[in-house]
Amino acid sequence: AVSEHQLLHDKGKSIQDLRRRFFLHHLIAEIHTA
């Protein structure tokens, strides 16, 4: 079974990549970053 800790770790892996994709979209669409 996958532990809760592992699930949280896996979720955390992509946070910067999500920020990265959001910021790239922000530069194009000028959506607010907050």
């Epitope: 910067q16 990549d17 910021f23 790239l24």
Partner: antibody
Amino acid sequence: QVQLVESGGGVVQPGRSLRLSCAASGFTFSSYGMSWVRQAPGKGLEWVATISSGGSYTYYPDSVKGRFTISRDNSKNTLYLQMNSLRAEDTAVYYCARQTTMTYFAYWGQGTLVTVSS
Amino acid sequence: QLVLTQSSSASFSLGASAKLTCTLSSQHSTYTIEWYQQQPLKPPKYVMDLKQDGSHSTGDGIPDRFSGSSSGAERYLTISSLQSEDEADYICGVGDTIKEQFVYVFGGGTKLTVL
């Protein structure tokens, strides 16, 4: 094809100002964020400034914040970098770069050399 | 502090495979990075972005001889069947947004020599 052509470089004395331009063609300029990246002679790359598609948002590293200003004129398909209070350490080739939806610096110009010297 | 570390130089034989390494600061080991190629006296060229899981997207005109992979804080650029035109500096970069501020840093670059 995407084309970015920088101009405005030259020799300038410390403390003086200079404005660089980047003429863009081959794509819808007003649809993309743009950046300036510099490279001191024989050294590595350094990000200098980024501006959003419409010019509403600008970003700078601490090394140039308050001295450099990035701007754009979408009607002229041109990106600018106003550089004030220039220092010897600002001597570099300055490149403009265009983002895509996937990455920050997908396309680069050929660069323009700025030399700050007395 | 967001830092990228690269070896300053590497040499490989013509036709061989080259594996170049970019190491993220330990607290940023999950970050997506970018690879750039800079041939002598030319501007940088975007090669690929490379995620923590090893998935990557290559830039326009980049041959499929170029691939990426990841292990922990290390990000690898592998060039197979090395050709003379692959001789260049290979630079990694990484960006992040913190409190509505953008930061982008480059590694020092690895000078690849094809023997």
